[in-house]
């Protein structure tokens, strides 16, 4: 069998809402993957499991099942959304994300994704992780790959 290539493209969009009373940030982050089947037979994308970390804390998880099949020598682009919550011991981020003296409220998130594919009863898992910048201050749609290269505000240490 030839390889099945998984390429994490980046954040497609991030939609933000707040709970003012709880000082909580809700971020719905949609990511894009390219999955390439280099084989001469079809493969099933059985599931995608993803999680998002902020400051080494898992803030969101998602799992998609029975997603699609990819034909021989074909590639499919798949979007998946991870709902995340920044709250409790990280509620200090609420003031940052809602600060009106800043235009762009970029935070660094660790995106982790595992794709499970099957073919002829054989199962294969491919994982990727990537740091991405996401604006927690407004709804943002990114050009693919753009969120890797954005500037993030560096607080004074």
């Amino acid at each position: 069998p030839r390889s099945i290539d998984v390429k994490y493209i980046g954040v497609k969009s991030a939609y933000v809402s707040y709970d003012v009373q709880k000082r909580t940030i809700y971020l719905n982050i949609t990511n894009t993957l390219n999955i390439t089947n280099n084989n001469y037979y079809s493969v099933e994308v059985e599931n995608i499991t993803a999680q998002v970390q902020f400051a080494k804390t898992v803030i969101g998880k998602a799992r998609l099942n029975n997603i699609t099949h990819i034909g021989p020598l074909d590639m499919k682009q798949i979007d998946y959304t991870v709902p995340t919550v920044i709250a409790e011991e990280m509620s200090y981020m609420y003031d940052f994300c809602t600060l009106i003296s800043i235009k762009v409220h970029n935070i660094v998130l660790m995106m982790q994704v595992t794709v499970t594919t099957t073919y002829f009863g054989h199962s294969e898992q491919i994982s990727q992780e990537r740091y991405q910048y996401v604006d927690c201050g407004r709804n943002t749609t990114y050009q693919l790959g753009q969120s890797e290269y954005l500037n993030v505000l560096q607080p004074q240490q």
Partner: antibody, heavy 122, light 112 residues
């Protein structure tokens, strides 16, 4: 240390112009909007406007449109307020301010300059 | 512009008393992100304004817990549970939701 340092007091003639400065230390002004506030003697606080130092885009309260001009120089980390056609009504203390992130925990700090006194007198 | 109206203009109190200052906006000051940027400042002569409360009720770091903010819509209140000598000065409400941002006219807290 995060702070805003404003230029010294000015005594000006009516009709003249004056340019006040506000120099930031401990943070980069291009990351923040910078604000200017006016307080006349025995009067309240008035919001003049805000500037985005990164691109120079400025927004003014209608009252100060044509009177005030905000600019910024990111290389010197300084914001400026120019007041034109001065009259006695412009006699006031002018403050620059912003709110910044001051540590790795993204905590915020309200930051004000010490104020610049402008006196317009013939 | 959003007009911010404060009541009263002057508030004479005895030390240890509770003080309450009202602020009313001419229109709702909910920002497009859902937050209400209603803030309270204390201004003392010869000093720069000091932020006490932001987003209606969020006490800023270092501000004593005798200060509390409340309200919604267009009506907001600042309460000082036990007035101390260092609390005297002029209090301003401020809205930072809609440009141009605007201050209230101020309330002078003074000794009775």
């Amino acid at each position: 240390e995060v702070q805003l340092q404003q230029s010294g007091a000015e005594l000006m003639r009516p009709g003249a112009s004056v340019k006040l400065s506000c120099t930031a230390s401990g943070f980069n002004i291009q990351d923040y909007y910078m604000y200017w506030v006016k307080q006349r003697p025995e009067q309240g606080l008035e919001w003049i406007g805000r500037i985005d130092p990164e691109d120079g885009d400025a927004e003014y309260a209608p009252k100060f449109q044509g009177k005030a001009t905000m600019t910024a120089d990111t290389s010197s980390n300084t914001a400026y307020l120019q007041l034109s056609s001065l009259t006695s009504e412009d006699t006031a203390v002018y403050y620059c301010s912003t709110r910044v992130i001051y540590d790795g925990y993204y905590r915020t700090m309200d930051c004000w300059g010490q104020g610049t006194s402008v006196t317009v007198s013939s | 512009d959003v007009l911010m109206t404060q009541i009263p203009l002057s508030l004479p109190v005895s030390l240890g008393d509770q003080a309450s200052i009202s602020c009313r906006s001419s229109q709702t000051i909910v920002h497009s992100n859902g937050n209400t940027y209603l803030e309270w400042y204390l201004k003392k002569p010869g000093q720069s304004p000091k932020l006490l409360i932001d987003k209606i009720s969020n006490r800023f770091s270092g501000v004593p817990d005798r200060f509390s903010g409340s309200g919604s819509g267009t009506d907001f209140t600042l309460k000082i549970s036990r007035v101390e000598a260092e609390d005297l000065g002029v209090y301003y409400c401020f809205q930072g939701s809609h440009v141009p941002y605007t201050f209230g006219g101020g309330t002078k807290l003074e000794i009775k």
